[in-house]
């Protein structure tokens, strides 16, 4: 399918609004510190250029890669080492070790200023008087602060944004309208930001078998009445979908995408039952639609496995013939029965059969050998099974936030070099997992803690790979991707941990902390928790506890004070003091 | 080893009610298929309904709209709630489970319908 103009093609494939969207979100993922307006101008000439070879696909240049042509255009911002330092050494590259460049310069926490929500009203007038400018800032600040963000999905939730504005602008109460919508797509864009970070983390990190095994689980026990011919194509194009846009190919990972989703709806009656609905839509809605469709209902009689993987005397003679065509079929064939099971534990039992197959293989009795392989899963089954009934038994007892704080102080003592601000994000990213998944009923409960969080030990793998200050989270984080919950949850106090020297200014408060909203406040709290913990690690619970319902109770008096900025030095002291008194400081 | 505990049979009038339960024990691996079959005398052994994981289920036709079957995922039970029986639903009903590993029938419990 080779065309003479690359560029000419991708425009006419996906239209001059989703090709200008599209390049605003590469390069502003690339150069996540230029202003928004040079972003613009630099679209604005690629997009042009692109008309060009729409005209004339012989046209001059026309006939470049598209990674020559935004790397050169990239290349041309003035202040490139100025901003981004050593990253203007890779325009001295030629393609394709300048786009792996750009791709390694990447920052996952850019220094960038937390984005402030303006009043509705200044949001509506901006909105109206120039929406396109509007909608446009809205893919730049997010693109650039998530730079791994899923393109063609972030084009959805811009689709989204601008009907929120559109409907709430022209409402009665418009902040009653918008602001709820709002915090809707701010969830929704962080949780889709963190699970597509995942995805290129296992391409990049581990490799497209990885990447592929996880999509034949996942799909598996999506479609469990599809064949395995059905999955094994869905997955090897979903892998390229994925390869693409992690790589920062994003017109074409749009353009993939689009061409999957109408396949996928052309064959709903090979894949799905649950399809229809997703397929009546507009094509980003349908994308989105199918990537979030439940699971279709299970095949009514599929047999055992042993059968086929265990007790028949074919086992080596299949596994030889094609290695990972037979284990990838043990995996669909284990996954469309296991709806109950999460992802990673379905690999992590496909991992121990393929270990037990290699060594069998080579035995004088395979059979004999293998025959108890499934007494190896049970446990490995049973280790997350217990650990999400405890999880759930004390995330019902504390509550939310009451479960983050055992998580912090729990992370805390396991690897207390890595940086407060990430321990407080990671832990209350952990702890929300009770009231996303312990609703559930217990056949809906493993896959989505498990799942989840494979997700948030991933953004604590990124960040702390950033700066690498801890050989335990280095360990966990690049030995298996299956196993890093499992490797976090092993992890014990760190004994070699030499305590932080106590600081007095990093307890002292102020009179801010009361106009701060509760999740802020949260914030403060659990920052100081964490810092308490770093002070003295071998702390007990009712210790903390103890000094946590002191600072609560400080806050509150301190609020409630007609001086409240005296209030929080002169008791601010006092608490210090108990604290170091109570923790024996 | 897998244990199935059946219970719930007994002697019941045409149009009245039983509740079949069957406890399977011993197994990590949970079912993903849970069924109840049933024989009546002189009969072959006919699925009367069935449930998977996913709460999917499928009904024999002479049962469907009078039996309900139900899972306790967690305890790996599973339920047959029999209302409005006849006289040719007696039979002995047998619970089968299946996991990755294998298929396990219950002993069996009576159930007979007359007045």
């Known amino acids: 399918d080779a065309h003479k103009s690359e560029v000419a093609h991708r425009f006419k494939d996906l239209g001059e609004e989703n090709f200008k969207a599209l390049v605003l979100i590469a390069f502003a993922q690339y150069l996540q510190q230029c202003p928004f307006e040079d972003h613009v101008k630099l679209v604005n000439e690629v997009t042009e250029f692109a008309k060009t070879c729409v005209a004339d696909e012989s046209a001059e240049n026309c006939d470049k890669s598209l990674h020559t042509l935004f790397g050169d255009k990239l290349c041309t911002v003035a202040t490139l080492r100025e901003t981004y330092g050593e990253m203007a050494d890779c325009c001295a590259k030629q393609e394709p070790e300048r786009n792996e460049c750009f791709l390694q310069h990447k920052d996952d926490n850019p220094n960038l200023p937390r984005l402030v929500r303006p009043e509705v009203d200044v949001m509506c007038t901006a909105f109206h008087d120039n929406e396109e400018t509007f909608l446009k800032k809205y893919l730049y600040e997010i693109a650039r602060r998530h730079p791994y963000f899923y393109a063609p999905e972030l084009l959805f939730f811009a689709k989204r944004y601008k009907a929120a504005f559109t409907e709430c602008c022209q409402a009665a109460d418009k902040a009653a309208c918008l602001l709820p919508k709002l915090d809707e797509l701010r969830d929704e864009g962080k949780a889709s930001s963190a699970k597509q970070r995942l995805k290129c983390a296992s391409l990049q990190k581990f490799g497209e078998r990885a990447f592929k095994a996880w999509a034949v689980a996942r799909l598996s026990q999506r479609f469990p009445k599809a064949e395995f011919a059905e999955v094994s194509k869905l997955v090897t194009d979903l892998t390229k979908v994925h390869t693409e846009c992690c790589h920062g190919d994003l017109l074409e990972c749009a353009d993939d995408r689009a061409d999957l989703a109408k396949y996928i709806c052309e064959n709903q009656d090979s894949i799905s039952s649950k399809l229809k609905e997703c397929c009546e839509k507009p094509l980003l809605e349908k994308s989105h639609c199918i990537a979030e469709v439940e699971n279709d209902e299970m095949p009514a009689d599929l047999p055992s496995l042993a059968a086929d993987f265990v007790e028949s005397k074919d086992v080596c003679k299949n596994y030889a013939e094609a290695k990972d065509v037979f284990l990838g079929m043990f995996l669909y064939e284990y996954a469309r029965r296991h709806p109950d099971y999460s992802v990673v534990l379905l690999l992590r039992l496909a991992k121990t059969y393929e270990t037990t197959l290699e060594k069998c293989c080579a035995a004088a009795d395979p059979h004999e050998c293998y025959a108890k392989v499934f007494d190896e899963f049970k446990p490995l089954v049973e280790e997350p099974q217990n650990l999400i009934k405890q999880n759930c038994e004390l995330f019902e007892q504390l509550g939310e936030y009451k479960f983050q704080n055992a998580l912090l102080v729990r992370y805390t003592k396991k690897v207390p070099q890595v940086s407060t601000p990430t321990l407080v994000e990671v832990s209350r990213n952990l702890g929300k997992v009770g009231s996303k998944c312990c609703k559930h009923p217990e056949a809906k409960r493993m896959p989505c803690a498990e799942d989840y969080l494979s997700v948030v030990l991933n953004q604590l793998c990124v960040l702390h790979e950033k700066t690498p200050v801890s050989d335990r989270v280095t360990k966990c984080c690049t030995e298996s991707l299956v196993n890093r919950r499992p490797c976090f949850s092993a992890l014990e106090v760190d004994e070699t941990y030499v305590p932080k020297e106590f600081n007095a200014e990093t307890f002292t408060f102020h009179a801010d902390i009361c106009t701060l909203s509760e999740k802020e406040r949260q914030i403060k709290k659990q920052t100081a928790l964490v810092e308490l913990v770093k002070h003295k690690p071998k702390a007990t619970k009712e210790q903390l506890k103890a000094v946590m319902d002191d600072f609560a109770a400080f806050v509150e008096k301190c609020c409630k004070a007609d001086d409240k900025e005296t209030c929080f030095a002169e008791e601010g002291k006092k608490l210090v003091a108990a604290s170091q008194a109570a923790l024996g400081l | 080893q897998v244990q199935l505990q059946e219970s719930g049979g007994g002697l019941v009038q045409p149009g009245g009610s039983l509740r079949l339960s069957c406890a399977a024990s011993?197994?990590?691996?949970?079912?993903?298929?849970m069924a109840w079959y049933r024989r009546a005398p002189g009969k072959e052994r006919e699925l009367v309904a069935l449930i998977t994981t996913d709460t999917s289920t499928n009904y024999a036709d002479s049962v469907k709209g009078r039996f309900t079957i139900s899972r306790d995922y967690a305890k790996n039970t599973v339920y047959l709630q029999m209302d409005s029986l006849k006289p040719e639903d007696t039979a002995a009903y047998y619970c089968n489970v299946r996991n990755v590993e294998r298929d396990y029938w219950g002993q069996g419990t009576q159930v007979t319908v007359s007045s």
């Open positions: 011993g197994s990590i691996f949970t079912f993903y298929r």
